[in-house]
Structure formats: C-alpha cells, structure tokens
Interface confidence: low
C-alpha cells in the first residue's frame, strides 16, 4: 500500500505543486534494513507514472542520481495540467519471478496561479434578503484555490466569507448572509474578491455599489383583478409589493396571443386600472417591480394571473341569408340562415338568437328564439316580407340585422352574366361574373351561394354563402370545398326589392369518373330510340360531369362505334337517338366526361330496332 510506505519514502523537489512547464525531481529512498536481500546491489528502484489510474510511463531512463540499492532520483518534465500520480517500486533483480513491490507514492499537481477575479456583481433579493456576490474567476487553475469575499461599508461595517474551487466544485458565488436595509440607501459599499492557491494569489479591483444598485425587489404576489361593474373591458389589477417599490411594469395578453401589452405605472401602490381589455377573453397578467425611478433593477416577472374577462352584450351585425320554396299556390317556406358572430363581436357565449319575420303592409309578425343558426317558417306567398335576427348573450342582444325577402331569381334583368368557376387549387374555386346588362334598379350586393351536388343536400345541409360588394365581380370560395366534388354555385344580384341569379357548376379538383352511367332501358317510340339511364353514384363522379356520351355499333362489327354527346343535366335521364337501322342488332353503352377525362364504359345493352328508320 503506497499510502502506508513501510518500505521507504518518496520526496519531491521543489514541491508537490508546480507551475505548468516546470520540472520536478522525485527521490525514492528505502528505509534501513528494507530491500530484496542482504546484497543491496540487487535492489533496483523504479518509478511509474499514472494518469487517471492508468500506467502511462516507466521512468527508468529518467534517473538523474542513484545510490545503488538505497535511493534513486528521477527528473520528470512536460507534466500536463492537473494531478499526476508517481509510484516508486522495488524490483529485486535476482528474482525474476516476483513482481516489483510498491515502496511509496506521491501526487504532483500542475497548475497556474489564480487570475484577478473580474466582473463582480452583487444582488440582494428583496428588502429582507441577503447580499450575494458572483464573479468571473478567470482561467481554471487546476489547483485547490481559496476565494475570500470581503465587504466594507459605513460605520466600520466589515464582513467576509470564503469558499474554494477544485476539480469537483467551482467557487464563483458567495452569500454574505447580511441584509442591507433601505435606511442605507445612499451609502456606498465596497466588495473585493481575493484568490489564493499554492502558486500565488491575486485580488480583484474594488467594486463599489449602493443599496439601490443591488437590491432586486421580490416579484409581486397575490395578483388579482376586479372588473368594475362586471365590465368586460375595464378592470382593476391589484397585487402585493414590497414597501419600497415605486415603479411597476405590467404586461398582459390574451392567452393565444404572441405579443404583450406593456404598461409602466409609477407609485401604483399595488393597484392599476386597465381600460382596453377584450370582453370574454382569457388573459394572462404579469407584474414586475423596481425600487427607484431611474436606478436599480427590475424584479423577475410575477407568477401569471390567468383569468377570463366578463361578457358584454354582442356587437356587430349577423350575416343572414335565406331560401324560398313554394309549397302550393298560396304558401311558401322561408328558411333563414345566419353565420355565428366571431368572438370579438359575440363578446360572450351566445345563448340564443331572436328571429322576426314581418309582413310589411299587414303588420303580421312572427317571432321566435332559437339556439340554432337557422329557422324555417311557412308564410303566405302574398305580401312583402322582411326578416331580422339578433344574437343574445348573458349581458344583452346585438342590434337586429334586417334583410328583405325577395324572389331571389325572379328578375331576369338582374341575372349576372358570364358566370364562370375555375379551380384554383385543391380547396377553393374562383367564381367570376359580369354585372347584369339591363338592370332597372341598382345592384346593392352580390351573394355567391354554393352547395355540394349530392342527393338530399338541399334538405340536409345549409347553404354556404359570401356577401360581395356591388363593385366586385369575383369571389374565391373555400369554406367546405373538397376536391373531387361538384358544387352548384349561384351568383345572386340583389337590389332593394328584387333579385336575379345565374347558376354554374364547379369543382376544385377533378378526375375522370370511376364508372359510366348504367343503361336501364331502351324503348322505341315513333321511329326513335329512347335510351334511359341511372346517374353515376355521387362518390364515383369525382367532379362535375360535363356531358354524357352514348355509343353504339352493330353487334359483331369491328368498326369504330358512333356516338352522341349530351350536355349533362341533373334532371335528365333519357335521350332519343334516331340514326339506327331497323332489324339490325346494336350494342349500346354510355360514358361520362369530366374536365379530367372520360370514364370507363358503363354496362352494354343490345337492341334491335323494329320500326322504319329515318
């Protein structure tokens, strides 16, 4: 065991701690009557060098002095920073079988003298906190280095604390454990840090500060807010602060926001009125404090107060639209639709809508409340009707929005011209049009309305619509637009008391249909054949069908088939053809065409016309 050193001793010159670049002499001496045998000349002392417990060198060749069989001196150079272990062993040269025996060992530390500590910074957290200082120690010394922090001030105030750095811990901060009170606000204090190790010492420049320079107030606590008269836009923020605070900084934002509203408040005394809050909005509030208007440091931000502002009555106008459907000769069904207010207009949870239908001349009024965004009533077809809707939350109702019920497509002179629908990308369609040519009253606005052309869509799904100012002739529709679906798009031109409309079909993306129409029957009437079919199922259309094609050819013929192309109309499911020869058997089939191409053929049917051909 090298720590016990029963066999001998190891010494280092000039010292076991040396500066980087220096050499050292290590002497290994055997104690009297210790050795391999009675022949001292057979004793051989060797020196082994270990770094991190790993043998890195046998210093046999570095012997500078040798008392045969008693002591040896070795010179070591180029030692790296940190600690190196040297172990002296006794090798008995006349006995090759026995391993060398440890005699003793020594650790040599290589390092540097400490640099003067720099960038001293002191803080006292809160009026009741204690002074703590930190500094930059400079280069690592690789040696145990002691640091002393000394503070001096008025009335012979002195105080000091110590700590040390080594390879396991770093000392660059000390808490002096003393409290500076506000009555010393004008006094000056001096701190100095001294560093010392086995290779030298150094001292920082003196660092001078006042109470206000170093005291960082504690962040405000117990933050709360009172909303004046349950107002959603005005509230008084209250908090607790340390007694000496003269300046506060407030920051607040809606929870989903990315930028803070900032406010500076002087002598707020834990209270500040906010007047620009948004009703019914989740907010986050934080406060910071400072002890002096010009000097000193801001506290950390307080913990957040998160709360929602109260509701206020809705503002803004509802976007209303409607559909009219004649039921019989004297009754019509009116379906009113409206869009939900956005949060900044709703200013609370909308509880219900107040809906009114009024006949202008007879003063008949139908009223109801609903929680839905649509309402349907049957009313007489006679008279001029107007509708109004308002939204209500717990604080009140919005001003009613009025709309005149007119025959939406009743006036041909108001129908927009040259309506087109172009696919822009996967989820929107650009609709363009020209104004009515000979409108006898001014267009007040355009409404672009669209719905998917799928079975039952009129009854199952409310329409989607956009209001367009009268000087605009285009709309990009995107709400609920999906690729490979055909939409019926109507452009309405509305005047004060009339409406005109034009219709077009459009899709945002298309493919050729999956299948062709299914021929269900072929009948002969008055020398013409009538082909009847069922439409392609909605999911298989994959866009707007532009036309159908009916193909026919004589059975067993290898000639190209003839074809007839029919403009697609949803309501049409039969078509006549008249160019077939009687008593010739034909094969007929159909395909469907979208802007992307033609479908595979549908089912084949054979037919042999009997009558006289044209």
């Amino acid at each position: 065991n090298i720590d016990v050193c029963k066999l001998g001793t190891v010494t280092v010159q000039p010292a076991p701690v040396i500066p980087l670049g220096s050499a050292a002499n290590i002497s290994c001496s055997l104690n009297p009557k210790q050795g391999c045998s009675h022949y001292p000349s057979s004793n051989e002392l060797i020196l082994l060098k270990f770094v991190n417990d790993v043998l890195v060198e046998n210093l046999h060749g570095k012997k500078v002095h040798d008392h045969t069989g008693h002591s040896s001196t070795f010179q070591v150079t180029n030692l790296s920073l940190g600690m190196t272990l040297f172990v002296c062993k006794l090798n008995c040269s006349n006995s090759q079988k026995k391993p060398p025996v440890p005699v003793c060992g020594v650790e040599i530390s290589v390092g540097v003298a400490p640099e003067p500590p720099q960038n001293i910074s002191c803080v006292q957290e809160g009026e009741n906190g204690t002074v703590a200082c930190s500094w930059n120690s400079g280069k690592v010394t690789y040696l145990k280095t002691n640091y002393t922090l000394q503070l001096s001030g008025p009335n012979n105030l002195t105080c000091q604390k110590q700590c040390f750095s080594d390879n396991r811990q770093n000392c660059n901060r000390l808490d002096l454990g003393i409290n500076l009170s506000p009555d010393l606000a004008e006094s000056r204090f001096i701190v100095r840090v001294t560093a010392i190790n086995d290779l030298g010492n150094s001292s920082s420049l003196p660092h001078t500060f006042t109470f206000l320079d170093i005291v960082i107030p504690l962040p405000p606590w117990d933050i709360r807010i009172n909303f004046l008269n349950a107002s959603g836009s005005r509230g008084t923020l209250q908090w607790e602060d340390e007694g000496q605070v003269v300046l506060n900084q407030l920051r607040y934002q809606p929870l989903n926001s990315t930028s803070w509203n900032m406010v500076n408040a002087t002598n707020a005394k834990g209270k500040y009125d906010l007047r620009d809050l948004r009703p019914f909005t989740e907010y986050e509030f934080q406060i910071s404090s400072k002890l002096h208007l010009s000097g000193g440091s801001w506290s950390n931000w307080s913990e957040s107060l998160r709360t929602r502002t109260p509701e206020e009555e809705p503002v803004g106008i509802l976007d209303i639209w409607y559909m009219k459907q004649d039921i019989d000769y004297d009754r019509q069904q009116i379906s009113l639709f409206w869009k939900s207010l956005n949060p900044s207009e709703a200013r609370g949870k909308i509880l219900h809508y107040q809906v009114t239908l009024q006949e202008v001349t007879k003063k008949t009024t139908l009223q109801n409340t609903t929680r839905h965004t649509s309402w349907t009533r049957v009313i007489p077809r006679t008279g001029a009707w107007t509708a109004s809707v308002s939204a209500a939350n717990s604080k009140g109702a919005s001003a009613p929005t009025h709309i005149n019920i007119v025959d939406l497509c009743g006036t041909g002179l108001l129908a927009p011209h040259q309506v087109s629908a172009k696919s822009e990308n996967m989820d929107n369609i650009l609709v363009t049009w020209q104004p009515p040519k000979k409108a006898d009253s001014a267009v007040r606005e355009y409404i672009v309305e669209w719905r998917a052309l799928q079975p039952g869509s009129i009854t199952k799904f409310p329409p989607h619509w956009l209001r367009i100012p009268p000087d605009n002739m285009s709309a990009l529709i995107s709400e609920n637009i999906k690729p490979y679906i055909c939409y019926e798009i109507r452009v309405h031109a509305l005047s004060e008391s009339q409406g005109g409309c034009s219709s077009i079909r459009g899709d945002s993306k298309h493919k050729a249909p999956v299948s062709g129409p299914h021929i269900t029957a072929i009948t002969e009437k008055k020398e013409r054949l009538f082909i009847s079919w069922t439409h392609i199922p909605f999911p298989e259309q994959r866009g707007c069908i532009l036309h159908y094609r009916i193909y026919w050819k004589e059975r067993d013929s290898t000639a190209q088939p003839e074809l007839c192309e029919i403009q697609y109309r949803r309501s049409q499911n039969s078509h006549p053809i008249s160019s077939l020869q009687p008593r010739v058997t034909y094969v007929l089939w159909m395909t469907a065409v979208t802007a992307a191409g033609e479908s595979p053929q549908g089912n084949e049917r054979e037919f042999c016309p009997q009558g006289k051909a044209n």
């Epitope: 117990d222 709360r224 913990e303 957040s304 107060l305 998160r306 709360t307 929602r308």
Partner: nanobody, 119 residues
C-alpha cells in the same frame, strides 16, 4: 365543468401519516389553483393549505405548518396533501377545491374524504 375526486383518507394512529390525492377532470389542470379544506363535526369548514397554479406559492394554516405539505404534479394532473405527525384534532372530512386562477373564491369542490386519527 370541473369534477374533483379525492382519495387517500382513512383511519390512522396519532403520529402516523397519510397522503391525500385529488385528481381534477374536465379542464386543463395546470391552470387551476388548488386547495385542501377540512370540516370537523360541529365546526365550520376551514382552509388547510393552498397552492398556486404553477406550484410556486403555497399557504398553510398555522395549525398544520411544519406537519402538512401541499404539492402538485401538473404532468399527472394531481394535487397532493402529505400529512405527517397526525393528531386526533386533525380528524375531519377533507375536501379538495379548485379555482380558475390564483385569486377569488373556489368554484369547484370534491365530495370529501374522511380522515380519522385515533389516540
């Protein structure tokens, strides 16, 4: 709506320990300030301990200071009350409560869990 469910109550000898848990559901737990109250037979309900939404600030009634510890684990959506050195006068129904911010009245309450300390 927030539902609070306490657990961990029971019978314990004086000097023993219990740990109560409270698991809210129905709202983001990390935005709720939490508290434990208790009500002994024939007495008014009293606050035992409170903890802010971030866990950075706590409060204890004088009668439990140094013996009880309130904590929260926002990752597990749970608030805890560690009760050590229990005394017979700690016997009560313990209620978990929550509020939507670090101020104001407690809006949400649990059903309560019985803690009985025998001598």
């Amino acid at each position: 709506q927030v539902q609070l469910q306490e657990s961990g109550g029971g019978l314990v000898q004086a000097g023993g320990s219990l740990r109560l848990s409270c698991a809210p559901s129905g709202r983001t737990f990390s935005t709720l300030a939490m508290a434990w109250f208790r009500q002994a037979p024939g007495k008014e309900r009293e606050v035992v301990a409170t903890i802010s939404w971030s866990g950075g600030r706590t409060y204890y009634a004088d009668s439990v200071k140094g013996r009880f510890t309130i904590s929260r684990d926002n990752a597990k959506n749970t608030a805890y009350l560690q009760m050590n050195s229990l005394r017979p006068d700690d016997t009560a129904v313990y209620y978990c409560a929550a509020r939507g911010s670090d101020y104001g009245s407690y809006d949400y309450w649990g059903q309560g869990t019985q803690v009985t300390v025998s001598s």
